[in-house]
C-alpha cells in the first residue's frame, strides 16, 4: 500500500539566512524523511531526517530569496507523495547613503545608514583612486555609523566603499570618492624685536596643523653649528636670546606633523650693536637713603665704583665699589632734605668709563601730624595721628594724669600702626597723651592732646524670672540715659545649640526671652553698648523647666484617716503609677500602690489621725520609672475655724468672721451668750461662709462667742472670742 | 527560670529578608513586654523594636522603620521579628529581652548573628 | 548621635571606687538602667530604677541621679567587674536609647 504523505508541512518563520519547518507525522509507518530544497542556482540539496522529527531548520541561505522544499515519508525502498511548500527569506537590511562628512589633508570621515542592530560588523576598504596598490581595510563594530580615516596623502583622489556582514553574509557594497586637502602650509615669518643678544620671531600658521615648529637659527657666513629650538604647535612666537651683537643670523622655520615637515620658512636680520653703559637713574628716594640702577650688558664690566657726594660741599665723597654683575644699589646713612650728585664708572681690567651722573635731593624728615583722641570711653581713649607711610620703625606713647606727678604710662607700638586703643584708664580723669616717632634711632619731635575719659556706665542685677518649658524673663539694672542698646545672648551650658543673640533699646530694664526647648541650662550673657563703649558682661544662668510628663500632685480631701493624691500625666505616656505613702517618722512600714497608667488619682483610707505622711507618686513607662513628685500632709480630726473677728457693733447687732479650716466642712455653728449668764443663742450657716449676722442683741452688754465646724457627725473644737454692743 | 532562645540568624544579600525568632519560657509570656536589641561588631548597643504584652502596641528605632516588623504569638511563647530590605549596616548580633513592668530589659536571650553582605 | 553620652573609657585600681556616668535629657524625667557585658556574652542588668539592684548583683553596684545626668558606682572594684557598661533610658517617644557605652578596666 502507498505511504502517507506528511502532513500540514508549513514555514513557521522566516529570517534573512534561514527557514524554519513544521509538520505533522503520517498515519502509516514509515523509516524516515527525506527533505528536499531548491537553491538559487537551481540545485537541489537532500536531506535525511529520522521518523521522529516534526521540524526543521534550513540555515547557510542566501537573503531574499525563493525556496522550494519537498518532504517525503520513506520506508525501505518505498516513498510517499511529498508534502510541498515554497518559503522566501528575508531581505536583508540593506547599506545606504554612504557620504564623505568631513575633508581633511590627510584624512576623511565617513557617515552611513543601516538598520539598528542588523550588523556584525562593517568592512570599509580605503583605495587611491587611479591606483592598483593594495587598498586598506578597516573592521569597524556593527553599532558605528560614522568613522574617521586617517594617515592619508594630501590632495589625493581616494575611492571608499564598504559593505556590511549579517550573520556571515555580505550585503552590497557601497562605494563614495573623495580627496583629501592641500597640505597647510606655514604663512609669513617676521622678526618682531631685535636686541643686541636677542630677538623675538613671530609666524602665521593654521590652527592646529602642526604639533611643533622647528626653528634653526644660523650666523650667516659661517659654518658654526646652528642653533636648534622647538616649541609646541599652539605658539606663534618665540624669544631667541644668546645672540652676539653687531652680527647676521639666518632664521628657519619649519611646521612638524608626525607625518611630514612643511616647506621651511626663513628671515634673515642683524643684531644690535653693543650699548655703553647707561641710564643711571634714581628708582627711591627716603629721607636717608636712595636706590641706583643702571643699564650695561651682561660681562662687560670687572665692577662699578659709585660716588655720593653732597652736592656744593667740598668734602670728600662717598665712594662704594660693587661688582660688575649688579645693575641696582641701595645707597644708606643720607641726610635728610640734602641734595647729592651720584656717579657712577664702569671698570674693565682697572680701567674706568666715563662717569653716568645724576642729582638727587632726599627727603626732608618725616614728621608726625595731628595727633587726635577720636574716642572717649569711660576706661580707655582711642588715639589717631598721622604720619608718612613705612617711614618709622616704632611710636612711643606716653599717658598721665593731668594733675598727677606718678610715673607715666609708657607705649612701645610698631611703626605701621596710626592708631591705638589706651585701655585700663580711670573713668572721668583727664589725661595727658604724647607720642614721639623713631626712625633709626632718631626721635621725632613729641605731639601731645589732652582728654578726659567719660563716666563709667554700669549695668548688675541681672535676674531670672518666670521659668517656664520655653522661656524665662530677665530684668536688670543701668545706668539710665547712656546706653544705647543691650546685647543679650543665650548659650545652652552644653553648647548644642546655636548661641541666640538679642538687641533691645538702652531704654528697656527687662526682656522676655521664648522660644527655648525644654529642660536646658542656659546661660545669659548681658552687655550695654553706649557710644563707643561696651560694658563688662554680666551674666546669670537659668534652666527651662522639664515638659510635664508627670506633674501637679495634689492632696485634697484631708480627713483624720485618710487623704485623696491627685495628680497630672501626660495622655497614654505611663505603663502604670506607683503611689508610695511613708510616715514621716519611718516608724510604719511604706504602702506601695500600684495604679493603671489611666488612673489621676487615690483615696487613701485607713491612716492615722494627727501624723505626718510624705506621699511620693512615680510613672513607669516599658520599666523605666520617673523621678517621683512628693508632697507631705497631716492627718487631722476636724480642723477648727481660726481668727474670730468682730466687726459692724451696733446696739442690737454685730458682724461675726472668721477663717475656714483647710478641710472641707458642711457647716459652722456659732454659739452667743452674755457674759453675765442667760440663755445661748445659736446661729447655723453653710459651710462656705466665713461670717454671719449676730441680732437681736442688748445694747451695753458682753457677749461670749463660740465657733465650731461640722461635718456629719463631727464636731471641731471650739474658737471663742468676745465683743460688748453699743 | 526565665530563658530566652534567639534563632534565624544567617548570611543574607543586601536587600534580602530575615526572619528572627525568641523561644520564651519560665514566664507568663503574654503579661511582658519584650524587645529587640542588636549589637553591630565592636560596637555598642542600640534598641531595634519593642512591642506590648498583648501585642496590641509597637515601637522601632528611626533606623529600621517601615523595614522590620516586630511581632509576638502568645500561644507559642515566641517573639518575632521580620527583617526585609536589608543593608550592610544592618549587620549585628540581634537579642531579644524581656521588660517586666518595673524593671526594664531583665533578662536577656544570647543573640543570633545576623550578617548582611553580598 | 546618641541621646545617652558615656565616657569611651574609664580604669580603676583594683579595690578602688569608680564611677561611670551617663548624661542626656530623657535623665531629669526618668531614672537610668545599667548593663553590664562581658566579651562574647550577653548583657545583664546590674541596676534599675532610683538604686535597685536586681537580685545575684553584688552590693557593691549602686545609681544615683542628679539633673540630666546618672552615675553608676562601684566601690571596691573587682576583677571580674572588668566590662562594658551601658546606660539606658526612655525617650519622649518612648523609644529606648541606650548611651555608648563605658569600657571599664580594673588595673
Known amino acids: 500500500s502507498e505511504l502517507d504523505t506528511p502532513k500540514d508541512l508549513q514555514v513557521s518563520e522566516t529570517a534573512e539566512t534561514s527557514l524554519t519547518l513544521l509538520w505533522k507525522t503520517p498515519l502509516a509507518k514509515f523509516d524516515r524523511y527525506r527533505l528536499n530544497y531548491s537553491l538559487p542556482t537551481g540545485q537541489w540539496v537532500g536531506v535525511q531526517l529520522p521518523r521522529n522529527t516534526t521540524s526543521y531548520v534550513l540555515r547557510g541561505l542566501e537573503p531574499g530569496q525563493e525556496y522550494n522544499v519537498l518532504l517525503t515519508a520513506e520506508k525501505g525502498r518505498h516513498k510517499s507523495k511529498p508534502a510541498r511548500v515554497k518559503a522566501s527569506t528575508e531581505q536583508a537590511p540593506e547599506l545606504e547613503n554612504l557620504t564623505v562628512t568631513e575633508v581633511g589633508w590627510d584624512g576623511l570621515r565617513l557617515n552611513w545608514t543601516a538598520a539598528d542592530q542588523a550588523y556584525e560588523h562593517f568592512i570599509i576598504q580605503v583605495q587611491e583612486a587611479n591606483k592598483v596598490e593594495a587598498a586598506r581595510n578597516l573592521t569597524v563594530p556593527g553599532s558605528l555609523r560614522a568613522v574617521d580615516i586617517p594617515g592619508l596623502k594630501a590632495a589625493t583622489p581616494y575611492t571608499v566603499s564598504i559593505y556590511g556582514v549579517i550573520q556571515g553574509y555580505r550585503t552590497p557594497v557601497l562605494s563614495a570618492e573623495a580627496s583629501t586637502g592641500e597640505t597647510p602650509n606655514l604663512g609669513e615669518v617676521v622678526v618682531a624685536e631685535v636686541g643686541w643678544d636677542a630677538l623675538k620671531l613671530n609666524w602665521t600658521a593654521p590652527e592646529g596643523a602642526y604639533e611643533y615648529f622647528f626653528i634653526q637659527v644660523q650666523e650667516a657666513d659661517t659654518v658654526e653649528a646652528a642653533q636648534n629650538l622647538t616649541v609646541p604647535g599652539g605658539l606663534r612666537s618665540t624669544d631667541l636670546p644668546g645672540l652676539k651683537a653687531a652680527t647676521h643670523y639666518t632664521i628657519t622655520i619649519r611646521g612638524v606633523t608626525q607625518d611630514f615637515s612643511t616647506t621651511p620658512l626663513s628671515v634673515e636680520v642683524l643684531t644690535e650693536e653693543v650699548p655703553d653703559m647707561g641710564n643711571l637713574t634714581v628708582t627711591e628716594v627716603s629721607w636717608d637713603a636712595l636706590r641706583l640702577n643702571w643699564t650695561t650688558p651682561d660681562g662687560t664690566y670687572d665692577q662699578f665704583t659709585i660716588q655720593v657726594q653732597e652736592a656744593d660741599q667740598v668734602e670728600e665723597a662717598h665712594n662704594l665699589t660693587v661688582p660688575g654683575s649688579l645693575r641696582s644699589m641701595e645707597i644708606p646713612g643720607l641726610r635728610a632734605g640734602t641734595p647729592y650728585t651720584v656717579t657712577l664708572h664702569g671698570e674693565v681690567r682697572g680701567h674706568s668709563t666715563r662717569p653716568l651722573a645724576v642729582e638727587v635731593v632726599t627727603e626732608d624728615l618725616p614728621q608726625l601730624g595731628d595727633l587726635a583722641v577720636s574716642e572717649v570711653g569711660w576706661d580707655g581713649l582711642r588715639l589717631n595721628w598721622t604720619a608718612a607711610d613705612n617711614a618709622y620703625e616704632h611710636f612711643v606713647i606716653q599717658v598721665q594724669e593731668v594733675n598727677k606727678v606718678e610715673a607715666a604710662q609708657n607705649l612701645t607700638l610698631p611703626g605701621s600702626l596710626r592708631a591705638v586703643d589706651i585701655p585700663g584708664l580711670e573713668a572721668a580723669t583727664p589725661y595727658r597723651v604724647s607720642i614721639y616717632g623713631v626712625i633709626r634711632g632718631y626721635r621725632t619731635p613729641v605731639l601731645s592732646a589732652e582728654a578726659s575719659t567719660a563716666k563709667e556706665p554700669e549695668i548688675g542685677n541681672l535676674n531670672v524670672s518666670d521659668i517656664t518649658p520655653e522661656s524665662f524673663n530677665l530684668s536688670w539694672m543701668a545706668t539710665d540715659g547712656i546706653f544705647e542698646t543691650f546685647t543679650i545672648e543665650i548659650i545652652d551650658s552644653n553648647r548644642l545649640l546655636e548661641t541666640v543673640e538679642y538687641n533691645i533699646s538702652g531704654a528697656e530694664r527687662t526682656a522676655h526671652i521664648s522660644g527655648l526647648p525644654p529642660s536646658t541650662d542656659f546661660i545669659v550673657y548681658l552687655s550695654g553698648l553706649a557710644p563707643s563703649i561696651r560694658t563688662k558682661t554680666i551674666s546669670a544662668t537659668a534652666t527651662t523647666e522639664a515638659l510635664p510628663l508627670l506633674e501637679n500632685l495634689t492632696i485634697s480631701d484631708i480627713n483624720p484617716y485618710g487623704f485623696t493624691v491627685s495628680w497630672m500625666a501626660s495622655e497614654n505616656a505611663f505603663d502604670s503609677f506607683l503611689v508610695t505613702v511613708v510616715d514621716s517618722g519611718k516608724l510604719l512600714d511604706p504602702q506601695e500602690f500600684t495604679l493603671s497608667g489611666t488612673q489621676r488619682k487615690l483615696e487613701l483610707r485607713g491612716l492615722i489621725t494627727g501624723i505626718g505622711y510624705e506621699v511620693m507618686v512615680s510613672g513607669f513607662t516599658q520599666g523605666h520609672q520617673t523621678k517621683p513628685l512628693r508632697a507631705e500632709i497631716v492627718t487631722e480630726a476636724m480642723g477648727s475655724p481660726k481668727e474670730v473677728i468682730f466687726s459692724d457693733i451696733t446696739e442690737n447687732s454685730a458682724t461675726v468672721s472668721w477663717r475656714a479650716p483647710t478641710a472641707q466642712v458642711e457647716s459652722f455653728r456659732i454659739t452667743y451668750v452674755p457674759i453675765t449668764g442667760g440663755t445661748p443663742s445659736m446661729v447655723t450657716v453653710d459651710g462656705t461662709k466665713t461670717q454671719t449676722r449676730l441680732v437681736k442683741l442688748i445694747p451695753g452688754v458682753e457677749y461670749l462667742v463660740s465657733i465650731i465646724a461640722m461635718k456629719g457627725f463631727e464636731e471641731s473644737e471650739p474658737v471663742s472670742g468676745s465683743f460688748t454692743t453699743a | 527560670e526565665v530563658q530566652l532562645l534567639e534563632s534565624g540568624g544567617g548570611l543574607v544579600q543586601p536587600g534580602g529578608s530575615l526572619r528572627l525568632s525568641c523561644a520564651a519560657s519560665?514566664?507568663?509570656?503574654?503579661?511582658?513586654?519584650m524587645s529587640w536589641v542588636r549589637q553591630a561588631p565592636g560596637k555598642g548597643l542600640e534598641w531595634v523594636s519593642a512591642i506590648s504584652g498583648s501585642g496590641g502596641s509597637t515601637y522601632y528605632a528611626d533606623s529600621v522603620k517601615g523595614r522590620f516588623t516586630i511581632s509576638k504569638d502568645n500561644s507559642k511563647n515566641t517573639l518575632y521579628l521580620q527583617m526585609n530590605s536589608l543593608r550592610a549596616e544592618d549587620t549585628a548580633v540581634y537579642y531579644c529581652?524581656?521588660?517586666?513592668?518595673?524593671?526594664?530589659?531583665?533578662?536577656w536571650g544570647q543573640g543570633t548573628l545576623v550578617t548582611v553582605s553580598s | 548621635s546618641s541621646e545617652l553620652t558615656q565616657d569611651p573609657a574609664v580604669s580603676v585600681a583594683l579595690g578602688q571606687t569608680v564611677r561611670v556616668t551617663c548624661q542626656g535629657d530623657?535623665?531629669?524625667?526618668?531614672?537610668a538602667s545599667w548593663y553590664q557585658q562581658k566579651p562574647g556574652q550577653a548583657p545583664v542588668l546590674v541596676i534599675y530604677g532610683k538604686n535597685n539592684r536586681p537580685s545575684g548583683i553584688p552590693d557593691r553596684f549602686s545609681g544615683s541621679s542628679s539633673g540630666n545626668t546618672a552615675s553608676l558606682t562601684i566601690t571596691g572594684a573587682q576583677a571580674e567587674d572588668e566590662a562594658d557598661y551601658y546606660c539606658n533610658s526612655i525617650n519622649s517617644t518612648r523609644n529606648e536609647v541606650f548611651g555608648g557605652g563605658t569600657k571599664l578596666t580594673v588595673l
Open positions: 529581652a524581656k521588660t517586666s513592668p518595673r524593671v526594664p530589659l531583665d533578662y
Open positions: 530623657s535623665l531629669r524625667s526618668y531614672y
Open positions: 519560665g514566664f507568663t509570656f503574654s503579661s511582658y513586654a
